[in-house]
C-alpha cells in the first residue's frame, strides 16, 4: 500500500537477462533457479495433494543496475522475478530434470511476489557530486495465488517516482564521512 506510492523510474536491465518483470517460462540460463519451497496450494486445486509445499512456482534470479539520471549503482542488485503458472513441484521445469510445464484446466493460478525487501544502494554519479543513495524494493520470494478478474499483473509495489517504468526503488547514499555505512552498502549488507 504505502509502497504503491513510490513508483520506480530508473532501472537498467542487464540485457542478457531479458525483459522485466515477467520473463517467459522458457527463459532459462545459469542466472535462474527453480525452487519448490514457496507458495501454497489454493483451494479447489485440481491436484488433490495434501502437502501444500508441493505446489510452487519458478523464482528466476534477476540482476539489474539501479540508475537515476546519469547515476548508476556501484554494483548490480539481484532479486527474484516470479515466473509462470503454479503447479506441483515435481512437474516444474528442472525440478527433477523434466521439462514439462503443468497447466491447470481450471482457474488461473499465478506466480506472484510474496515478500519484498529493501536494499540500500550507493549511486555513482559523474562529476564528483555529493554521494547519493537510494533504497530499492526488491522481490524476496514468490507465491502461488489464484487470480480472479479483480487481479492484474501489477502487484509489484515500489517506492519510486515515475509511473510506467520498470520496478525499482531509490535512495541516495550518505556522505563520505560515513565510512562504515558506505562499506556496508558496497558489500550489499542487506
Amino acid at each position: 500500500q504505502g509502497w504503491q506510492a513510490f513508483k520506480n523510474d530508473a532501472t537498467e536491465i542487464i540485457p542478457e537477462l531479458g525483459e522485466y518483470p515477467e520473463p517467459p517460462p522458457e527463459l532459462e540460463n545459469n542466472k535462474t533457479m527453480n525452487r519448490a519451497e514457496n507458495g501454497g496450494r489454493p483451494p479447489h486445486h485440481p491436484f488433490e495433494t495434501k502437502d501444500v509445499s508441493e505446489y510452487s512456482c519458478r523464482e528466476l534470479h534477476f540482476t539489474r543496475y539501479v540508475t537515476d539520471g546519469p547515476c548508476r549503482s556501484a554494483k548490480p542488485v539481484t532479486e527474484l522475478v516470479c515466473s509462470g503458472q503454479c503447479g506441483p513441484a515435481r512437474l516444474l521445469p528442472n525440478a527433477i530434470g523434466r521439462g514439462k510445464w503443468w497447466r491447470p484446466s481450471g482457474p488461473d493460478f499465478r506466480c506472484i511476489p510474496d515478500r519484498y525487501r529493501a536494499q540500500r544502494v550507493q549511486l555513482l554519479c559523474p562529476g564528483g557530486e555529493a554521494p547519493r543513495a537510494r533504497k530499492v524494493r526488491l522481490v524476496a520470494s514468490c507465491k502461488c495465488k489464484r487470480l480472479t478478474r479483480f487481479h492484474n499483473q501489477s502487484e509489484l509495489k515500489d517506492f519510486g517516482t515515475e509511473a510506467a517504468r520498470p520496478q525499482k526503488g531509490r535512495k541516495p547514499r550518505p556522505r563520505a564521512r560515513s565510512a562504515k555505512a558506505n562499506q556496508a552498502e558496497l558489500e550489499n549488507a542487506y
Partner: antibody, heavy 118, light 107 residues
Framework: QVQLVQSGAEVKKPGASVKVSCKVS????????QHWVRQAPGKGLEWMGW????????EYASKFQGRVTMTEDTSTDTAYMELSSLRSEDTAVYYC???????????WGQGTTVTVSS | DIQMTQSPSSLSASVGDRVTITCRAS??????LNWYQQKPGKAPKLLIY???RLLSGVPSRFSGSGSGTDFTLTISSLQPEDFATYYC?????????FGGGTKVEIK
C-alpha cells in the same frame, strides 16, 4: 496510503531543547530515508539533514551540526528530530519528510510549529 | 553552500496563462534539481525531480528544463489549484539548498 503524522506545537525558552516526532504509516520506516526541513515564518525552506533508520546513518547540514540529532524507532515506525540550544531564530515550522532517496522528499508531514521565546 | 536564486519572487497571473519560474544556481549543479509546490498552511509537495522528471500523478501542464546553473519550471496553462508558492532544490552538493520561492498569485 502513505502518511506522516507529526507531534503538536511546542513553545520553548532560549537554550532549551525540543524533540519533534514523526509517525510514518503505509510502509516500514526502515525502508526509507527520513528528512527534516524547516521553514521560518514567512520564509523559505531549509534542509536540516537526513537519516537512514535501518543503520542509523545520518547526514546533517553543517549549520545544524552539533545541535541536531535525528533518530528513529523502527518498532513504532517513528522518526525523531531533537534540536538543542534553541535560539529565537529557530522559531519555525519543522517538517519531516520521507522518500527512497537521500536527495528528494517524496512525502511530508503536516509540520510542527516550534516557538522559541523568552 | 550552493545558493539558489528564484525569480521572480512573486507574480500575478490568470487562469489559462503560461507561467515560467526561473531558478539559478551559484555554481554548476548539472541536472540535480527538484521542484516543490507549497500552498498556504500546508506542507510542500514534490512535483518534479532531476530537472524534468514529473512525479507520478502530477498534471502534465507542469514541466521542467535547464542544466548547469539555469533552470525553469513552466506551467503551460495555469489552473485555479496551481496558485501556490514554488521552490527549487539542488542536490548536487551538501547541504541541499532551496531557492527563496516564487509565489504565484491570482491577477
Amino acid at each position: 496510503q502513505v502518511q506522516l503524522v507529526q507531534s503538536g506545537a511546542e513553545v520553548k525558552k532560549p537554550g532549551a531543547s525540543v524533540k519533534v516526532s514523526c509517525k510514518v504509516s503505509g510502509f516500514p520506516i526502515k525502508d526509507t530515508f527520513q528528512h527534516w526541513v524547516r521553514q521560518a515564518p514567512g520564509k523559505g525552506l531549509e534542509w536540516m539533514g537526513w537519516s537512514d533508520p535501518e543503520i542509523g546513518d545520518t547526514e546533517y547540514a553543517s549549520k545544524f551540526q552539533g545541535r541536531v540529532t535525528m533518530t528513529e524507532d523502527t518498532s513504532t515506525d517513528t522518526a525523531y528530530m531533537e534540536l538543542s540550544s534553541l535560539r529565537s531564530e529557530d522559531t519555525a515550522v519543522y517538517y519531516c519528510a520521507t522518500g527512497d532517496t537521500t536527495y528528494k522528499f517524496d512525502f511530508w508531514g503536516q509540520g510542527t510549529t516550534v516557538t522559541v521565546s523568552s | 553552500d550552493i545558493q539558489m536564486t528564484q525569480s521572480p519572487s512573486s507574480l500575478s497571473a490568470s487562469v489559462g496563462d503560461r507561467v515560467t519560474i526561473t531558478c539559478r544556481a551559484s555554481q554548476d549543479i548539472s541536472n540535480y534539481l527538484n521542484w516543490y509546490q507549497q500552498k498556504p498552511g500546508k506542507a510542500p509537495k514534490l512535483l518534479i525531480y532531476y530537472t524534468s522528471r514529473l512525479l507520478s500523478g502530477v498534471p502534465s501542464r507542469f514541466s521542467g528544463s535547464g542544466s548547469g546553473t539555469d533552470f525553469t519550471l513552466t506551467i503551460s496553462s495555469l489552473q485555479p489549484e496551481d496558485f501556490a508558492t514554488y521552490y527549487c532544490q539542488q542536490y548536487s552538493d551538501y547541504p541541499w539548498t532551496f531557492g527563496g520561492g516564487t509565489k504565484v498569485e491570482i491577477k
